[in-house]
Interface confidence: low
Amino acid sequence: QDKPFLSAWPGTVVSEGQHVTLQCRSRLGFNEFSLSKEDGMPVPELYNRIFRNSFLMGPVTPAHAGTYRCCSSHPHSPTGWSAPSNPVVIMVTGVHRKPSLLAHPGPLVKSGETVILQCWSDVRFERFLLHREGITEDPLRLVGQLHDAGSQVNYSMGPMTPALAGTYRCFGSVTHLPYELSAPSDPLDIVVVGLYGKPSLSAQPGPTVQAGENVTLSCSSRSLFDIYHLSREAEAGELRLTAVLRVNGTFQANFPLGPVTHGGNYRCFGSFRALPHAWSDPSDPLPVSVTGNSRHL
């Protein structure tokens, strides 16, 4: 018998209270199907029901978590139904409080190098799941290390390529409720750097300014970068600006830092909109120093 194909949109990881569409596709073109849930809590709205094309399930509760299969109508089968489809595991998030996700040594990773993603929580999660935004396949399942203060897992990812870069979140779960996940961690952008030549970074009016004076950092390159990213050493985030084509043929972005009070080492990177997590080599560091202030970083 032809097995239909079951899929979940927008994905298999669903926040509590949201909806998920289960779609059952038959290669023979039959669009009526039944759904069954293999494990977890019962979902009475599936029993003895025939669905057409797709089923919008929700608002999702933890009871919806589990493994689903569909059977499509099949007039030539003795039972009137196809063989069961592939399994789809629906995981429901928001059941436990969120864990934290960190990158060691940091979220900017040189092409070819390795980064360690650490998910940790003060809840004793026996399992962690690592999920990359925009990926429909199942999240990576990791076994947590339990300790008195909670739990954690370290995942070594590499060698780094653009295919591995992206926005990551992690979830925790407990053994008895494998498909009922915590709220997601705050997102962590893992960026691969070193894919293109480095841009140049300069400061106007200059790299040494009076405390309270305005300074603008300009990042430019002859490469066709759409976006420039400015980062300050020892700081997590980055500023992001669209590149503008200048008369001299360079693509440039000006970062007005406003009245500065503290200096620091700055670097900029270039990237393309189509690959937002793949950046150039860093520019040479530009030390900005502030006079008339006791703290020079």
Epitope: E38, M41, P42, L177
Partner: antibody, heavy 119, light 107 residues
Framework: ELQLVESGGGLVQPGGSLRLSCAAS????????MNWVRQAPGKGLEWVAE??????????HYAESVKGRFTISRDNAKNSLYLQMNSLRAEDTAVYYC??????????WGQGTLVTVSS | DIQMTQSPSSLSASVGDRVTITCRAS??????LNWYQQKPGKVPKLLIY???ILQLGVPSRFSGSGSGTDYTLTISSLQPEDVATYYC?????????FGGGTKVEIK
């Protein structure tokens, strides 16, 4: 629809034996730890026995009150759970329910089968 | 074995009343606490699992809370159809144990 149908109960004399069966349908029986829970007339619920999965080598666990007298078993091919009860006592009189274990709980229950131990 | 002590053993309240049933475990059960409702002559029905997660189809007037050894089932506004005996159960460690039950009646 998920169904659990217990059978095999009845009247038996103290020291006698009975074999309870539970026919499961509507869910993947082989994926679940299966349990027997009982309820004496007018009393509360008491967990009796558990059998785990093939991957757990069908490990079994029993309440102290039935250890050595009761044996839990399963036949995944038949979607069936069994409870062999030997050396029955008056205090084993109860409705026996078969129930799968999930999420640290018993989400599905059959209608139960009544075992009466009396002379 | 983990002992589960439920209180009160019975209570009588008016329709619309807020009803609270407590369950105390003899040791920490890490939130693996479930609540069941058994109506007269019927089979037990899972209401709440893992301390506070409502089983699908259970009215939102039922809620659960607690941690460690102390857990609570609350019915925010008692309805006639809530007349039943309520049992707590720990799923943290074998042997799985139930509380003695709380019989809820309407005044």
């Amino acid at each position: 629809e998920l169904q659990l149908v217990e059978s095999g109960g009845g009247l038996v004399q103290p020291g006698g034996s009975l074999r309870l069966s539970c026919a499961a349908s509507g869910f993947t029986f082989s994926n679940y730890w299966m349990n027997w829970v009982r309820q004496a007339p007018g009393k509360g619920l008491e967990w009796v026995a558990e059998i785990r999965l093939k991957s757990n080598n069908y490990a079994t666990h029993y309440a102290e009150s039935v250890k050595g007298r009761f044996t839990i078993s399963r036949d995944n091919a038949k979607n069936s759970l069994y409870l062999q009860m030997n050396s029955l006592r008056a205090e084993d009189t109860a409705v026996y329910y078969c129930t799968p274990f999930y999420g640290s709980s018993f989400p599905y229950w059959g209608q139960g089968t009544l075992v009466t131990v009396s002379s | 074995d983990i002992q589960m002590t439920q209180s009160p053993s019975s209570l009588s309240a008016s329709v619309g009343d807020r009803v609270t049933i407590t369950c105390r475990a003899s040791q920490d059960i890490s939130n693996y606490l479930n609540w069941y409702q058994q109506k007269p002559g019927k089979v037990p029905k899972l209401l709440i699992y893992y301390t506070s997660i409502l089983q699908l189809g259970v009215p939102s007037r039922f809620s659960g809370s607690g941690s460690g050894t102390d857990y609570t089932l609350t019915i925010s506004s008692l309805q006639p159809e809530d007349v039943a005996t309520y049992y707590c159960q720990q799923g943290n460690a074998l042997p799985f144990t139930f509380g003695g039950g709380t019989k809820v009646e309407i005044k």
